[in-house]
């Protein structure tokens, strides 16, 4: 790497993947192993993120970009850039301080993460319950009771379980 200078900042010509080395009269030196600089003109390289424990490497560190992590099976990412991994639960459960707990009656969770949410209140929209809710599924609202033909029931048996990971359309 050749020493480069500009009229303003001698470091401004150092490209990504290098740093402007104080210890060598501000020449552009390559980033040491396990470090990177994603922009030019840096006075130092940043330490590469290490994906350890519950984290696993999604993208290796290079001299110009940091490593990216995701979570091992049974966990999912939380926070910007997957800063934390949180335990998965089953559909129909939510994660509490004491671990995975089933959704209370009247609530559901159709994912392996997040909290249990209340079933939709069909009557607020002037509709009736077409399909009962479960721990894993929201209720399905149907036409309003007035729209139903005489003798028709507004409640049908629960729909057959869908494949995990698919939420109602």
């Amino acid at each position: 790497f050749e020493r480069t200078r500009s009229l303003q900042d001698p470091c401004s010509n150092c490209p990504a993947g290098t740093f402007c080395d104080n210890n060598r009269n501000q020449i552009c030196s390559p980033c040491p192993p396990n470090s990177f600089s994603s922009a030019g003109g840096q006075r130092t390289c940043d330490i590469c993120r290490q994906c350890k424990g519950v984290f696993r490497t999604r993208k290796e560190c290079s001299s110009t970009s940091n490593a990216e992590c995701d979570c091992t099976p049974g966990f999912h990412c939380l926070g910007a850039g997957c800063s934390m991994c949180e335990q998965d639960c089953k559909q129909g459960q939510e994660l509490t301080k004491k671990g995975c707990k089933d959704c209370c009656f009247g609530t559901f969770n159709d994912q392996k993460r997040g909290i249990c949410r209340p079933w939709t209140n069909c009557s607020l929209d002037g509709k009736s319950v077409l399909v009962n809710g479960t721990k894993e599924r929201d209720v399905v609202c149907g036409p309003s009771p007035a729209d139903l033909s005489p003798g028709a029931s507004s409640v049908t048996p629960p729909a057959p379980a869908r494949e995990p990971g698919h939420s109602p359309q």
Epitope: N22, N23, C31, T44, D46, I47
Partner: antibody
Framework: QVQLQQPGAELVRPGTSVKLSCKAS????????INWVKQRPGQGLEWIGN????????NYNQKFKDRATLTVDKSSTTAYMQLSSPTSEDSAVYYC?????????????WGQGTSVTVSS | DIQLTQTTSSLSASLGDRVTISCRAS??????LNWYQQKPDGTVKFLIY???RLHSGVPSRFSGSGSGTDYSLTISNLEQEDIATYFC?????????FGGGTKLEIK
């Protein structure tokens, strides 16, 4: 683990010279800068200079440039600082330190320091 | 050379206190500010680099902040083992320079 071993004390006659040693272990000696720092009794810290053992590139604080010489022996992973024509002003503790990697220009490990007394 | 000024040379605090030590640079040092702890026996430990990044193994009660010319080290819950002298150091420009130190004592 990283260690920088320095002798505890050195007694030096004024006008002579003294060569302080710093034995490094627990890491790749040639890959990190060695810095030397001076501390007079009850006072602050002064950076003397540094050396990169791989190619022996050195930087000096102008204040010490004429009298301090930094060298290394790669085979024994030892760094040296020679101080010529010492006076009572040079009586101090001298620390050898390792500069961290990547370079935030911070020293991450310090030796115990060598107490130098200049006296006739 | 860049001068670093630690205006408070000594500081008295009680165990459990939150303590802040300041360091001012004579010019903008772009966050290249590091902190060290020196125990009474002369042992020096590296605490914080690049203004706010904790060195491995340093307790989380230590934190650093600042920008431009003004920087500080905070100890959130003072413990007996924190009694020491604290030095700042700039890594922006050669020659690297240190502050004069702030000696922390127990009330």
């Amino acid at each position: 683990q990283v260690q920088l071993q320095q002798p505890g004390a050195e007694l030096v006659r004024p006008g002579t010279s003294v060569k302080l040693s710093c034995k490094a272990s627990g890491y790749t000696f040639t890959s990190y800068w060695i810095n030397w720092v001076k501390q007079r009794p009850g006072q602050g810290l002064e950076w003397i200079g540094n050396i990169y053992p791989s190619d022996t590139y050195t930087n000096y604080n102008q204040k010490f440039k004429d009298r301090a010489t930094l060298t290394v022996d790669k085979s024994s992973t030892t760094a040296y600082m020679q101080l010529s024509s010492p006076t009572s002003e040079d009586s101090a503790v001298y620390y050898c330190t390792r500069m961290g990697d990547p370079f935030y220009y911070a020293v991450d490990y310090w030796g115990q320091g060598t107490s130098v007394t200049v006296s006739s | 050379d860049i001068q670093l000024t630690q205006t408070t040379s000594s500081l008295s605090a009680s165990l459990g206190d939150r303590v802040t030590i300041s360091c001012r640079a004579s010019q903008d040092i772009s966050n290249y500010l590091n902190w060290y702890q020196q125990k009474p026996d002369g042992t020096v430990k590296f605490l914080i680099y690049y203004t706010s990044r904790l060195h491995s193994g340093v307790p989380s009660r230590f934190s650093g902040s600042g920008s431009g010319t003004d920087y500080s080290l905070t100890i959130s819950n003072l413990e007996q083992e924190d009694i020491a002298t604290y030095f700042c150091q700039q890594g922006h420009t050669l020659p690297y320079t240190f502050g004069g130190g702030t000696k922390l004592e127990i009330k």
